[in-house]
Amino acid sequence: FPMFKRGRCLCIGPGVKAVKVADIEKASIMYPSNNCDKIEVIITLKENKGQRCLNPKSKQARLIIKKVERKNF
């Protein structure tokens, strides 16, 4: 089995607890991989306001993950 490592995670720190739904353009979920040992939820903000990492343990992140998984499977 490949070793999981933290070094190449996309997010730094725990992430924000919530983002205003009205500000969300897109949500992307990165599952644990060889590059990063944790799930990451990346929010793309509207109006070119960049991206934010959402704390994967937050209520909002759990809802987003559930929604995406329902859509994909």
Epitope: C11, I12, G15, G50, R52
Partner: nanobody, 126 residues
Framework: EVQLVESGGGLVQAGGSLRLSCAAS????????IGWFRQAPGKEREGVSL????????YYADSVKGRFTISSDNAKNTVYLQMNSLKPEDTAVYYC???????????????????WGQGTQVTVSS
């Protein structure tokens, strides 16, 4: 009220050392990434180093790698920047900043940070 207060700047000769401190208050320290930036006269503010208090991960700009060390004391809500082998080109006002939800891609983007200190002057003479 959120506050970031830098201290430890001063005048030092080339090759010398300084330790900067950034004392944070008014927010949950563990939720934030603390970054050090600097701005030399007539230049843009640039990222120097950052630390995530939650897991201790650290990042450095190439220009300071091997010379500067960032650390944090979570009990004191304080981040330190130990600067060794200082060069005249390190002369600048040094600022600490707090950001949340940062991506590596944007880690030294000024706009990614929510709170800023007032800065402390570092002057390195040759």
């Amino acid at each position: 009220e959120v506050q970031l207060v830098e201290s430890g700047g001063g005048l030092v000769q080339a090759g010398g050392s300084l330790r900067l401190s950034c004392a944070a208050s008014g927010f949950s320290f563990d939720d934030y990434v603390i970054g050090w930036f600097r701005q030399a006269p007539g230049k843009e503010r640039e990222g120097v180093s950052l630390i995530s208090s939650s897991d201790g991960s650290t990042y450095y700009a190439d220009s300071v790698k091997g010379r500067f060390t960032i650390s944090s004391d979570n009990a004191k809500n304080t981040v330190y920047l130990q600067m060794n082998s200082l060069k005249p080109e390190d002369t600048a006002v040094y600022y600490c900043a707090a950001g949340n939800g940062l991506l590596r891609l944007w880690m030294f983007h000024v706009s990614a940070y929510d709170y800023w200190g007032q800065g402390t002057q570092v002057t390195v003479s040759s």
